[in-house]
Structure formats: structure tokens, C-alpha cells
């Protein structure tokens, strides 16, 4: 998907943290160096989503694949690929 | 590098009220269905999270999007 | 924060006509859906209309179609219940009702309540 | 329209009581519920909706289950500010209906 491109650490966090499942949120904040303090708040946020269950979690994967793909962040990375192209060209 | 919409999304998230950050939601997903539940997530990461926490939330995002890796 | 502030209510006699007024503020008014929901002397709440955030869309509850009239004037972040051929069973607090959700969400949840005003219909 | 019914319609109870209100719908309302909490001379209060989600700033004794035409609103230790009428309403259909309400008094 485009927009995992864009930032992909961001996404595995937020899926992690949607999905519920602790171990993979432990593996992708160690990525990042995420301090302890840091780590019990995001398992603050993952509890709600394990609260609210599964609909919840998909409900709310959909508004950020939405938002990821709408043409506010598409327009940016289309931006960014040309900005990316001519630094590219004026590199060679 | 992450787009400006689903960073403020997330900065919402932790640090405005539920009608700011539903009424954001609101310009993707104008779905009853999905803006009820999020505004059912942000009550309770609200009611669960500290200042604190949501200062390491926000610690832990700085870091994510300075990532290589991002 | 949310605030809304009826106004308009009062004693009236039967067959008469009264206007309440509800202003809102403290919200981003033309998001929302409004409603006006009301509540007899010791008795049960009971949702009398709605009018969609952009005001396109009306509903009434059976006993008050075709008497009752909601509108709203969002540049004055303003609600508006006109109330025609009043009888006595509309003796009751009325109260002015934001929905929880925004735009396509005036699913009728009242997320905010004013105080309510009391219109009492009697000769 | 949907009728909603409650019981008790009302219910005595002590500080530190763990209560349970029961809500009926005659037909399927899906997870369209909401509770609110009224005080007397004080407008509603809406304390869960979608028939299980917290309100922003109500506590975390009270939860609400349920679906389709069942459902309850829990409040699991008494506090003296509960003491109040509580109402579920329908939001199913356009033509939203509350519950007869339920005052919880002091025993």
C-alpha cells in the first residue's frame, strides 16, 4: 500500500496497536527506541482498542487508511515524489 | 515522511477534545457507524491516559517521525 | 464549551401559537444536528424534532406534524421550535438538544442539553 | 414506533450498591442505545451510547451492555450523586424513543 511508503514505521505501530496484539507493539516500538514510559502509554491506547473489540479496530483502520489515501496525503506524496525527481535530476 | 493529515489526526487524538477530533474524522468518514466509535476510543484513551502518558505518546510519535525509518 | 440557552417559553391558551428560540454557542454550530426534545410535569422525556446541520432535513414526532415547525439560521448559530395550534398535552419543558455526532451523524443522540424552557398551553 | 421499556420503573438502593437497570426494545435496535442520567429540575445527561461507549467524564462504574432488544446499564458501586431517573433511548430510526425511566432512590 502507497501510503506505508510514506512513513512505514508509523503504520506498524498504528496497526500494532489496533490489531491488540502486545508482542508486535513491543517489536515495533523497539525499532525506535521507545523508552518504558513510552511504551505503557501506547499499551494505554491498545487497551482501548482490545476494549472496544474487533468492529472498533477495523472502524478505525478504515478512517486512517481513508485519511492515508484522501487527497490531502496523496497530493503530498505526489509533491514530494516530484520535489524527490528534481533533486534526482540536478543530482546527475 | 508522514502526511500533515494523519499527523494531525494523531495529535488530536491524544490532545484535543472528543467533538475536535471527531469533527476531523468527520471530513474522511462522515459515517455514524465510524464517528461513534471514534469518539467511543478518544472518551476512553481520555479517561485512561494521564498528562503524562499522553506526553510520552507524544515523545514516542516525535521519534517515529524523525525515524530513518519513517 | 457547549452552551445552549432556551428562550421563548411561557403560559398560553389553547389553539395559540408561541416560538422558542435556542442559542447555541461554544461548538462548531453548522456541523450539527439540532433537536428539541421535551418533558411533561413528572413525566418521561419524549423527542419532538430534528433538523439536520445544514438544515436540509426535517423530522417530527407523530403528534406535532403539520403544528410544529423547527428551523434554524446558522449564521446566528440559532434554533428555532414555532409552535402552532398548541393543546394542553403540550404542556412541558422543552429542551434544546445537540447531537453527539457531526454532519451525517445527526444520528439522534443528544450529546448536550440546555435547560429548558416551560410552556405551559392552558385557559 | 419502537417502544422501549424499563424496569424497575423504580429501585432502592445503598451507597456502594452494585445496581442494574434492564432496557427493552419491541423490535431489534441493533446496538443503537443511549442512557442518560437526570436529576430533578436539571436537563439529561447522556451517559453511554451505542449501547456500551462511555461518555467523555462519566465515570467508569457505569457500563452498558447489550444488543438487538436487550440491554442493561450497570453501575457497579453506588456513589450519592447516582442517585437520580435514568432513561434509555432508541436512535434505531428517525423517530428516536425513550424508556419510561427508572428513579433510583435511597433505600
Known amino acids: 500500500v502507497k501510503m506505508a511508503e510514506t512513513c512505514p514505521i508509523f503504520y506498524d505501530v498504528f496497526f500494532a496497536v489496533a490489531n491488540g496484539n502486545e508482542l508486535l507493539l513491543d517489536l515495533s516500538l523497539t525499532k525506535v527506541n521507545a523508552t518504558e514510559p513510552e511504551r505503557t502509554a501506547m499499551k494505554k491506547i491498545q487497551d482501548c482498542y482490545v476494549e472496544n473489540g474487533l468492529i472498533s479496530r477495523v472502524l478505525d483502520g478504515l478512517v486512517m487508511t481513508t485519511i492515508s489515501s484522501s487527497k490531502d496525503c496523496m497530493g503530498e506524496a505526489v509533491q514530494n515524489t516530484v520535489e524527490d525527481l528534481k533533486l534526482n535530476t540536478l543530482g546527475r | 515522511e508522514i502526511c500533515p493529515a494523519v499527523k494531525r489526526d494523531v495529535d488530536l487524538f491524544l490532545t484535543g477534545t472528543p467533538d475536535e477530533y471527531v469533527e476531523q474524522v468527520a471530513q474522511y468518514k462522515a459515517l455514524p457507524v465510524v464517528l461513534e466509535n471514534a469518539r467511543i476510543l478518544k472518551n476512553c484513551v481520555d479517561a485512561k491516559m494521564t498528562e503524562e502518558d499522553k506526553e510520552n505518546a507524544l515523545s514516542l510519535l516525535d521519534k517515529i517521525y524523525t525515524s530513518p525509518l519513517c | 464549551q457547549v452552551v445552549l440557552v432556551e428562550s421563548g417559553g411561557g403560559v398560553v391558551q389553547p389553539g395559540r401559537s408561541l416560538r422558542l428560540s435556542c442559542a447555541a454557542s461554544?461548538?462548531?454550530?453548522?456541523?450539527?444536528?439540532m433537536h428539541w426534545v421535551r418533558q411533561a410535569p413528572g413525566k418521561g422525556l419524549e423527542w419532538v424534532a430534528v433538523i439536520w446541520y445544514d438544515g436540509s432535513n426535517k423530522y417530527y414526532v407523530d403528534s406535532v406534524k403539520g403544528r410544529f415547525t423547527i428551523s434554524r439560521d446558522n449564521s446566528n448559530n440559532t434554533i428555532y421550535l414555532q409552535m402552532n395550534s398548541l393543546r394542553a398535552e403540550d404542556t412541558a419543558v422543552y429542551y434544546c438538544?445537540?447531537?453527539?455526532?457531526?454532519?451525517?451523524?445527526?444520528?439522534?443522540?443528544?450529546?448536550?442539553w440546555g435547560q429548558g424552557t416551560l410552556v405551559t398551553v392552558s385557559s | 414506533d419502537i417502544q422501549m421499556t424499563q424496569s424497575p420503573s423504580t429501585l432502592s438502593a445503598s451507597v456502594g450498591d452494585r445496581v442494574t437497570i434492564t432496557c427493552r426494545a419491541s423490535q431489534s435496535v441493533s446496538s443503537w442505545l443511549a442512557w442518560y442520567q437526570q436529576k430533578p429540575g436539571k436537563a439529561p445527561k447522556l451517559l453511554i451510547f451505542k449501547a456500551s461507549g462511555l461518555e467523555s467524564g462519566v465515570p467508569f462504574r457505569f457500563s452498558g451492555s447489550g444488543s438487538g432488544t436487550e440491554f442493561t446499564l450497570t453501575i457497579s458501586s453506588l456513589q450519592p450523586d447516582d442517585f437520580a431517573t435514568y432513561y434509555c433511548?432508541?436512535?434505531?430510526?428517525?423517530?428516536?424513543?425513550f424508556g419510561q425511566g427508572t428513579k433510583v432512590e435511597i433505600k
Open positions: 461554544g461548538f462548531t454550530f453548522s456541523s450539527y444536528g
Open positions: 433511548q432508541q436512535y434505531n430510526t428517525y423517530s428516536p424513543t
Open positions: 438538544a445537540r447531537s453527539l455526532i457531526p454532519v451525517a451523524g445527526t444520528d439522534p443522540i443528544f450529546g448536550y
